[in-house]
């Protein structure tokens, strides 16, 4: 199934003019993601059933090794480049989680809605970050890494990877919301 974000190499061929108050919109999107991250995380690990809710540190700890770094004390340009990498990584990861959860928890309406809503906001955020990078800093290319592919994993590994990723997402989005 298609991923919620299909990343492309950033080029400065922006088809539409950037949104007014672009940084305000980026801040607003980060605030909304931050506001909903905890609910998504709890809903996710609860929906997985045992042993997840009682083993959060072990199974859902935010130890995601290849997660892109973020430095809150950098320049706006540096922070936006790092934010771009993080959003691409999260977008592909969420796509995998959503795909897996549709199979593993087909009737979890609220979980699916929150995963999809998060992916939608991330899509808009990615577009705004790209617009800002191109229009203000003329950055036309950002090297990115994508989230881990879970398609070949067993059920438990899929659940665990998703839980770790959402734990990391919750932690990271709080930092990002503060940094901008």
């Amino acid at each position: 199934s298609p991923l919620p974000i299909t990343p492309v190499n950033a080029t400065c061929a922006i088809r539409h003019p950037c949104h007014n108050n672009l940084m305000n919109q980026i801040r607003s999107q980060l605030a909304q993601l931050n506001g909903s991250a905890n609910a998504l995380f709890i809903l996710y690990y609860t929906a997985q059933g045992e042993p997840f809710p009682n083993n959060l540190d072990k199974l859902c700890g935010p130890n995601v090794t290849d997660f892109p770094p973020f430095h809150a004390n950098g320049t706006e340009k540096a922070k936006l480049v790092e934010l771009y990498r993080i959003v691409v990584y999260l977008g592909t990861s969420l796509g995998n989680i959503t795909r897996d959860q549709k199979i593993l928890n087909p009737s979890a309406l609220s979980l699916h809605s929150k995963l999809n809503a998060t992916a939608d906001i991330l899509r808009g955020l990615l577009s705004n970050v790209l617009c800002r990078l191109c229009s203000k800093y003329h950055v036309g290319h950002v090297d990115v890494t994508y989230g881990p592919d879970t398609s070949g994993k067993d059920v438990f590994q899929k659940k665990k990877l998703g839980c770790q990723l959402l734990g990391k997402y919750k932690e990271t989005i709080a930092v990002l919301a503060q940094a901008f």
């Epitope: 609910a39 709890i42 609220s110 809605s113 929150k114």
Partner: antibody, heavy 120, light 107 residues
């Protein structure tokens, strides 16, 4: 402007059936999931049905599961609620509701409502 | 199911005053709370979602706050047109549930 207009309410005998309709306009109907929410005479609010934008997924609370069926006709921009085995506790104003964005779980746009009275 | 409790059925206030309407969830709902206003003879209107985000067009005198199980809708400078019934709703998990409502009366 988002417009939702419910119809089909009226007096129904206990055990009877009724089909409500909701005509939608002012937005791309097929892009949004839709909800039915009801308000009892005592002013209590209750979510009663959800249907995905394509109509392939539906959800109901236990209070109406097995008795109510939500459906939609995207070609006609119309939402339906088929109610059967009606009870007096089903007496309420029934609202057709749209979320603000595709996956939101709060109720942004409401119709004017249609009153269903279940009584002998 | 998650039970949403609005302990005050009625609240009385004066124009220009600040009023806070409270809502308590039977479990932690992680900010997944919306608030609605229903004026007499009208359909409900969305004010707030995710506990503190104002819906489009909602005046900034309406503010949502809270966390865990306790949530508050505050109207900072009450106006005569704020006479209405106010509901909270949890959008944390299905079935989505509402509080019983708080009727705001203007003295």
């Amino acid at each position: 402007e988002v417009m939702l207009v419910e119809s089909g309410g009226g007096l129904v005998q206990p055990g009877g059936s009724r089909r409500l309709s909701c005509a939608a306009s002012g937005f791309t109907f097929s892009s949004y999931p839709m909800f039915w929410v009801r308000q009892t005479p005592e002013k209590r609010m209750e979510w009663v049905a959800y249907i995905s934008n394509g109509g392939d997924s539906t959800y109901y609370p236990d209070t109406v599961k097995g008795r109510f069926t939500v459906s939609r006709d995207n070609a006609k921009n119309t939402l339906y609620l088929q109610m059967s085995s009606l009870k007096s506790v089903d007496t309420a104003i029934y609202y057709c509701v749209r979320p603000s964005a595709r996956y939101d779980e709060w109720f942004a746009y409401w119709g004017q409502g249609t009153l269903v009275t279940v009584s002998a | 199911d998650i039970v949403m409790t609005q302990s005050h059925k009625f609240m009385s206030t004066s124009v220009g005053d600040r009023v806070s309407i409270t809502c308590k969830a039977s479990q932690d709902v992680s900010n997944a709370v919306a608030w609605y206003q229903q004026k007499p003879g009208q359909s409900p209107r969305l004010l707030i979602y995710w506990a503190s985000f104002r819906h489009t067009g909602v005046p900034d005198r309406f503010t949502g706050s809270g966390s865990g199980t306790e949530y508050t809708l505050t109207i900072s400078r009450v106006q005569a047109e704020d006479l209405a019934l106010y509901y909270c709703q949890q959008h944390y998990n299905t079935p989505y549930t509402f509080g019983g409502g708080t009727r705001l009366e203007i003295k």
